[in-house]
Interface confidence: low
């Protein structure tokens, strides 16, 4: 289980039409459910139940987004429509280039993601928890445009890789 270095860039537009970028670095782990690869894309926050909807036409995003899913406590969803791995697969089928799970409320999900599938996803499936998860969700909940960049080595410079 390797460290995933995640950079998140938040875009704040000003009245003049310019925008300011704020870069935050955090770390997670690549799970065995997916590939250990770099990925980049606009963040799309997905509710775990939103991934239950099988009607893809209602929920299509441009190919190449990074899905962020905050998992609920298992008690709040005793009969989930999909396993955590199933949720990751559903996101990838809808065009996600990577999926990041906040497992703070559901640490059991880590074992589920690391059980090792015979057919792992070809895209990264990363999990974050604790302070890193808080940082990520603080940005995601701002409802602003944000991009995530996932790497399997520390970035050299904060903005080196971002494709604006």
């Amino acid at each position: 289980k390797e460290t995933a270095f995640v950079e998140v860039v938040l875009f704040e537009s000003s009245p003049s039409g310019d925008y300011t970028t704020y870069t935050t670095g955090l770390t997670g782990r690549f799970s065995r459910a997916g590939a250990t690869l770099s990925a980049e894309g606009e963040i799309v926050q997905m509710h775990p139940l939103g991934l239950c909807n099988n009607n893809d036409e209602e929920d299509l995003y441009e190919y190449g987004w990074v899905g962020v899913v905050k998992l609920e406590q298992p008690e709040l969803d005793p009969k989930p429509c999909l396993t955590v791995l199933g949720k990751a697969k559903r996101a990838v089928q809808r065009g996600a280039t990577a999926v990041i799970f906040d497992v703070s409320e559901n640490p059991e999900a880590i074992d589920q993601l690391n059980q090792g599938s015979e057919d792992p996803l070809k895209r990264p499936v990363v999990y974050v928890k604790g302070a890193d998860a808080i940082k990520l969700m603080n940005i995601v909940n701002k409802q602003k445009v944000a991009r995530a960049r996932i790497q399997h080595r520390p970035p050299r410079q904060p903005t080196e890789y971002f494709d604006m």
């Epitope: 590939a35 990838v92 089928q93 065009g95 399997h152 080595r153």
Partner: antibody, heavy 116, light 108 residues
């Protein structure tokens, strides 16, 4: 500068194999899928498969399964595509391409001619 | 399997607008990317996603989507835009790329 440099042109006889190399520079080789795409003379682009340079995992287009093998040597940041049991219709330019959500960087192409 | 269909050829006068379509039944067209290829050269990405231009690609290139058809539009077409254009889409089930048959753009 990010670039992919491919090996030179090859002439092969039917039934032989060819191995094309693609050397990456200017970025972390293991960070992105590498794809192989070919183009027969006067024809369109045809996707052959990809390799994850970090793990070595591969996925081949159904048409080429059993004949194509994609490998990599991370120590020299090079991807390889080997096509076996060559036939005349395999005459084409073979490209490697890095995928960063889309295929953004392409090699210059390697012409493989299959002729008896 | 996904199939992407393009017109084999499109002609346009210099300064006019050229439109090249790419249609596919089983794929959301918003996943389509566009490549330009000139004779003897490797393909070059000109539009990705909805209508994003990589750096170095002129503003006259744009992309749009409607239903299952993606369209590449070149406004104020110039002689140097004469080339073959390919749409490409990621096949989520086959886990690979599919290309359209290509469109030869002729600038009269």
């Amino acid at each position: 500068q990010v670039q992919l440099v491919q090996s030179g042109a090859e002439v092969k006889k039917p039934g032989a194999s060819v191995k094309v190399s693609c050397k990456a520079s200017g970025y972390t080789f293991t960070s992105y899928h590498m794809h192989w795409v070919r183009q027969a003379p006067g024809q369109g682009l045809e996707w052959m498969g990809w390799i994850n340079p970090y793990t070595g995992d591969t996925n081949y287009a159904q048409k080429f399964q059993g004949r194509v093998t994609m490998t990599r040597d991370t120590s020299i940041s090079t991807a390889y595509m080997e096509l076996s049991r060559l036939r005349s219709e395999d005459t084409a330019v073979y490209y490697c391409a890095r995928e960063k959500v889309y295929m953004d960087i392409w090699g210059q192409g390697t012409l493989v001619t299959v002729s008896s | 399997d996904i199939e992407l269909t393009q017109p084999p050829s499109v002609s346009v006068s210099p300064g006019q607008t050229a439109s090249i379509t790419c249609s596919g039944d089983s794929i959301p067209s918003k996943y389509a990317h566009w490549y330009q290829q000139k004779p003897g050269q490797a393909p070059v990405l000109v539009i990705y996603g909805k209508s994003h231009r990589p750096s170095g690609i002129p503003e006259r290139f744009s992309g749009s989507n409607s239903g299952n058809t993606a369209t590449l539009t070149i406004s104020g077409t110039q002689a140097e835009d004469e080339a073959d254009y390919y749409c490409a889409a990621w096949d989520l089930l086959g886990d690979g790329w599919v290309f359209g048959g290509g469109t030869k753009l002729t600038v009269l």
